[in-house]
Every structure is written in structure tokens, then in C-alpha cells.
């Protein structure tokens, strides 16, 4: 195979590349968890980064009593559907419009029982750590909102003053699913083979999934002078020599300073 | 796309009648629902009477006895007849339809709109 690479040893440098790493005839492409010229480093850093938004979808169910069941609200592509989900969507609209997590309404089914509405209120907030708790509160807030609007609207003498008017005892809500997004699952998943030395911490509110070889974080490892590694077993110090020291210790924080050494030997030879 | 047109208003003395029509082209009229509103000046708009396909009726209370709504399917058009007429009844008269058997005087339920034509009863 020719490359473009230049020096000695060149020539092999395709068959070199490890963990995975592919010659593009001028040099090592790296897959995502590597670096180096070999991809032989073990990166510090994965992008995990979260989806701006997270969604959650409720199944509900309520029965309208202000429209009469005609087959035609069966077919998807009918007039007659197409004017009930315009009229069922703007009275959502209005129901659920105190609730920022609120994105709107999919009727999945119309069935007879005066109508009985099968739907889905879809709920979006953006990504935090706390994003739970905030779909949760809302998924609260749209079943006080369907409850009350569905025994406060409702028909007197077959006559509905509202918008649309429902059945009271017809609201239930079937399912809810929030989209799943788990950082250290992701981390643990990314990192592979070492997935047990990366962790998830937050800055900003974004999650960083990184070993202890990242600098500024709480659990970065101090290699001082020296550079940290990432092995099989772990993150590890590799200490440097200067012109003037030799750095030693699980954190190359031991100097010993060359001359001190060099004149113990002769001393002693 | 559906249009209704609405026509027969005018000026007309307390006690005098006027019979208004609607003519609709764009869907199958023997189907959904079918009103006549009214709104004054400076008042909401108001549900006056009301029909459905499956021969539901509704009036307002200030217009029973007095309005009959009536539709003819062979010429798309429906009715209001308006007799012993009051200077409350001044307004501007819409039709409204839908294609959905409704069962609510509330107008943001109804999808199609006339124009609208005036009624004013004065003497």
C-alpha cells in the first residue's frame, strides 16, 4: 500500500494503527474512544451529549358529548375528522395552555360512545438534569386539567354552551412514556472496555463524560509534572524527567533531583 | 372549499317579518349541522337557532315562537323565517354550518361562516 507518509518505518505505520484504527494513506483514523498517531491514547473526554429536548407522551382517552358519532369520523382523511380534530385541538389549546411543557394533541382513534376520543398529549422541556421531575409535575397537570374541564363542561338538557362538552365519568389515562435518557448509562456504554474509570459530571447543567485524566473536574487525577493515561486497570501517572529531576510517585509528585544522585554514585564509586 | 351566502335581511318595523337564506355550495348538505347566529353591536355572538342532520333543533328562548329554521336539501339553502320582529332582534345575521352532527350553541365549534347580512328593526 504507498501512503505519503514520510521517515523511518513509514512503510508500516498502515499496519500499526491499533484499537481499531484504519490508514487513510496519510495517517490514522481513530475510532470515537481513541487518539494518537497510532490511536494508541485513550481519550479523556466523550461527547454524550444530550438531545436539547426531552418528550413525554400520555394516553388519554375522553368522551366528547357535544358531536354526535357518524361513521365518517372513522376515516382519518374525512372531512368530518378533519373538522372534529381542528375543534378537539383548539379546545386543548385552551385547556392545557397554562402548562409551558404542553406541545400538543394527536387523536389516534374516534369510536362511538357519543365520541370517545383516543388521543395523545405530547409534553417537551428542555434537557436538565431535573427533567423527571419537571415531566412528571406537568403529566400531573394535565390530568388536573383534563379532570376539570371534563365535569365542568358538560351538557345541560342536550344542549352544550362550550366549545365541546364531555362526559365526565369518560376521562382515563391509559399510559404515559417519557423518552429515556440516562447519562451514565451512556458514559458507562461509550467508554467500553473502561467503562468502569469514566463517570458523568455536570457543568452548566450539561453532563461530561470523562476519566480521571480530564482536567477541571472533581475527580481529575493531579499527575503534577507527568501525563495521565488511561490503561485497562485504570488511570495512571506517567512521570516525566527533566534535565534537572526525575519525577517518581503514583502522582509524580516525588522529585529527585539528578545531581543528588549522580553525586551519591560517584561518592560511592 | 365551502361558502354559504347569506341574503334577505333589511329594515323592517316591530311586528314585521323577514325570511333570510343561505345558500351553501362545497359539501353535501343533507350532512352535519346548520345555524343561523346573530350578533348585536358591541354583544357577543349568539345562536338564534340551529338544526342537524338527524333533526335536532334548538332556538334561543327570545326567538321562540317567533323563528322557524328550515332547510331545503334540493337547493342547498337553509332558512330562517323571522315574524313578530322586535327592536331586539336588530343584529347582523350569519349562517354558520359544519359538517359534524353538533350539539353546541358555543360559535367556536362551528367551522363554516357567511358573511353575514343586517337585520334592523325599527320604526
Known amino acids: 500500500r504507498t501512503t505519503t507518509c514520510f521517515g523511518d518505518g513509514c512503510q508500516n505505520t498502515a499496519s500499526r494503527c491499533k484499537n481499531g484504527g484504519t490508514w487513510d494513506g496519510l495517517k490514522c483514523q481513530c475510532p470515537n474512544l481513541y487518539y494518537g498517531e497510532l490511536c494508541e491514547e485513550v481519550v479523556s473526554s466523550i461527547d454524550i451529549g444530550p438531545p436539547e429536548t426531552i418528550s413525554a407522551q400520555m394516553e388519554l382517552t375522553v368522551t366528547v358529548t357535544s358531536v354526535k358519532f357518524t361513521e365518517e369520523l372513522k376515516n382519518h382523511s374525512s372531512q368530518e375528522f378533519q373538522e372534529f380534530k381542528q375543534t378537539f385541538t383548539e379546545q386543548m389549546n385552551i385547556v392545557y395552555s397554562g402548562i409551558p411543557e404542553y406541545v400538543g394533541v394527536n387523536i389516534t382513534k374516534l369510536r362511538l360512545g357519543s365520541v370517545v376520543v383516543e388521543h395523545d398529549v405530547l409534553l417537551r422541556t428542555k434537557y436538565t438534569p431535573e427533567y423527571k421531575t419537571v415531566l412528571d409535575n406537568a403529566t400531573e397537570v394535565v390530568k388536573e386539567k383534563i379532570t376539570k374541564v371534563t365535569t365542568q363542561q358538560i351538557m345541560i338538557n342536550d344542549i352544550c354552551s362550550d366549545m365541546m362538552c364531555f362526559n365526565t365519568t369518560g376521562t382515563q389515562v391509559q399510559n404515559i412514556t417519557v423518552t429515556q435518557y440516562d447519562p451514565e448509562e451512556d458514559c458507562r456504554k461509550m467508554a467500553k472496555e473502561y467503562g468502569d474509570y469514566f463517570v458523568v459530571e455536570y457543568r452548566d447543567q450539561k453532563p461530561y463524560c470523562i476519566s480521571p485524566c480530564e482536567p477541571g473536574f472533581s475527580v481529575s487525577k493531579n499527575c503534577n509534572l507527568g501525563k495521565c493515561q488511561m490503561s485497562l486497570s485504570g488511570p495512571q501517572c506517567l512521570c516525566v524527567t527533566t534535565e534537572t529531576h526525575w519525577y517518581s510517585g503514583e502522582t509524580c509528585n516525588q522529585g529527585t533531583q539528578k545531581s543528588l544522585v549522580y553525586g551519591h554514585h560517584h561518592h560511592h564509586h | 372549499e365551502v361558502q354559504l351566502v347569506e341574503s334577505g335581511g333589511g329594515v323592517v318595523q316591530p311586528g314585521g317579518s323577514l325570511r333570510l337564506s343561505c345558500a351553501a355550495s362545497?359539501?353535501?348538505?343533507?350532512?352535519?349541522?346548520w345555524g343561523w347566529f346573530r350578533q348585536a353591536p358591541g354583544k357577543e355572538r349568539e345562536a338564534v337557532a340551529l338544526?342537524?342532520?338527524?333533526?335536532?333543533?334548538f332556538y334561543a328562548d327570545s326567538v321562540k315562537g317567533r323563528f322557524t329554521i328550515s332547510r331545503d336539501n334540493s337547493k342547498n339553502t337553509l332558512y330562517l323565517q323571522m315574524n313578530s320582529l322586535r327592536a331586539e332582534d336588530t343584529a347582523v345575521y350569519y349562517c354558520?354550518?359544519?359538517?359534524?352532527?353538533?350539539?353546541?350553541?358555543?360559535?367556536?365549534?362551528?367551522?363554516?361562516w357567511g358573511q353575514g347580512t343586517m337585520v334592523t328593526v325599527s320604526s
Open positions: 354558520a354550518a359544519s359538517v359534524l352532527v353538533l350539539r353546541t350553541l358555543n360559535p367556536k365549534a362551528w367551522h363554516h
Open positions: 338544526i342537524s342532520s338527524d333533526g335536532w333543533t
Open positions: 362545497g359539501f353535501t348538505f343533507s350532512r352535519g349541522s
